[in-house]
Amino acid sequence: MRWCLLLIWAQGLRQAPLASGMMTGTIETTGNISAEKGGSIILQCHLSSTTAQVTQVNWEQQDQLLAICNADLGWHISPSFKDRVAPGPGLGLTLQSLTVNDTGEYFCIYHTYPDGTYTGRIFLEVLESSVAEHGARFQIPLLGAMAATLVVICTAVIVVVALTRKKKALRIHSVEGDLRRKSAGQEEWSPSAPSPPGSCVQAEAAPAGLCGEQRGEDCAELHDYFNVLSYRSLGNCSFFTETG
């Protein structure tokens, strides 16, 4: 049993039980993000509000397959991205050595049973280092002014709502803020314990071949949820080939 399986199982625990028979889940993503050329960025999605089992997560950029995390099999990184893409954290994907050409839409495609496929979209803008620095110098005072204005407006709105709605509470929920906190803390995406072998996990007959369409609709079933809890850590060993 493997690491990705544990992550998927843990995600399953967090999902609220809802009526089955229709696609009730929602994908939360980090939304629109920007990063500097040469840097790294974590792409992160989170499926919630469904009890469906996540069997596979595909990461795609426009029409190109970047990586697959399969509950049965593990990670497969597309050969053309193998030097710049790292699996994780969790079911996410880390893009390294960013270039301006990496700017664009990225999709996390969750294959689930019995719901089917959920897709999340992230837009990444890769900025030239100088542009990012130059932009930051001028944006700081502007952002400060904007923030102050927003605080005033928000306060006024809250007062008005409070007065008009009397004692009805106003709930403000920021998906992006949640995801950033989760990502920073990691515990939402990956336990802090040493990783057992197989973040996500193995084998031959999954999608990602030589020719043809880059989107695989078939994916393996998630099996044996609970055995993963007894999976032993390997300790501090270097890369090896599993023989059994």
């Epitope: 099999l73 084998a203 031959e204 030589l210 020719c211």
Partner: antibody
Framework: EVQLLESGGGLVQPGGSLRLSCAAS????????MSWVRQAPGKGLEWVSA????????YYADSVKGRFTISRDNSKNTLYLQMNSLRAEDTAVYYC????????????????????WGQGTLVTVSS | QSVLTQPPSASGTPGQRVTISCSCS????????VSWYQQLPGTAPKLLIY???NRPSGVPDRFSGSKSGTSASLAISGLRSEDEADYYC???????????FGGGTKLTVL
């Protein structure tokens, strides 16, 4: 030593059935996807079917869809291929093969290829 | 007809370097993983290369895999008589949901 041993081949009439078995040893069978690949006399390799470790995701070549059924018994470390409605063109040596996986401390990666093959079993469909 | 196209035959003299190509008849080969297999006469196939260019343990470094554009290649340097065999490329095909093999290349050592 990692080994795959096929059995169950033989002579069968067109329209008949046959069940091939592949006994695996030397590795944790339940962790790996497995495939059947065949080779007609004097011809090239033709992939037939594959099954994921848990047995829930299965793939078939168009030429055998609806006639062949792949299955596995992880408790017996055995892969099966049930072949029904056999045709003369199904005559071939049938190999079972194990998928590739490598693991690091934190991740296992799967690749597209078969790193261990059995010796093959001959299936002849003829009247 | 196979989705992967290989030359039916190739030849070389001992010590020479030979290259066998495997081209994709449809989309770009770049995003997909190629494996290479050797089949000596009367034996089961053996994996030579996986994930485009990786050699399993036990495969001599005379064998190497590469990929460029719409074609993958298997190179054999320092050719030996025991390299005389059939060579197949293979890959998973998304559109077919199937593993596909090239038609095979018969290598003759002159």
């Amino acid at each position: 030593e990692v080994q795959l041993l096929e059995s169950g081949g033989g002579l069968v009439q067109p329209g008949g059935s046959l069940r091939l078995s592949c006994a695996a040893s030397g590795f944790t069978f339940s962790n790996y996807a497995m495939s059947w690949v065949r080779q007609a006399p004097g011809k090239g390799l033709e992939w037939v079917s594959a099954i994921y470790p848990g047995g829930g995701s299965i793939y078939y070549a168009d030429s055998v869809k609806g006639r062949f059924t792949i299955s596995r018994d992880n408790s017996k470390n055995t892969l099966y291929l049930q072949m029904n409605s056999l045709r003369a063109e199904d005559t071939a040596v049938y190999y079972c093969a194990k998928a590739i996986r490598t693991c690091s401390l934190s991740h296992c990666y799967y690749y597209y290829g078969m790193d261990v093959w059995g010796q093959g079993t001959l299936v002849t469909v003829s009247s | 007809q196979s989705v992967l196209t290989q030359p039916p035959s190739a030849s070389g003299t001992p010590g020479q370097r030979v290259t066998i190509s495997c081209s994709c008849s449809s989309s770009n080969i770049g995003n997909n993983a190629v494996s290479w297999y050797q089949q000596l006469p009367g034996t089961a196939p053996k994996l030579l290369i996986y994930y485009d260019s990786n050699r399993p343990s036990g495969v001599p470094d005379r064998f190497s895999g590469s990929k460029s554009g719409t074609s993958a290649s298997l190179a054999i340097s320092g050719l030996r008589s025991e390299d005389e065999a059939d060579y197949y490329c293979g890959s998973w095909d998304y559109s077919l949901s199937a593993y596909v093999f090239g038609g095979g290349t018969k290598l003759t050592v002159l």
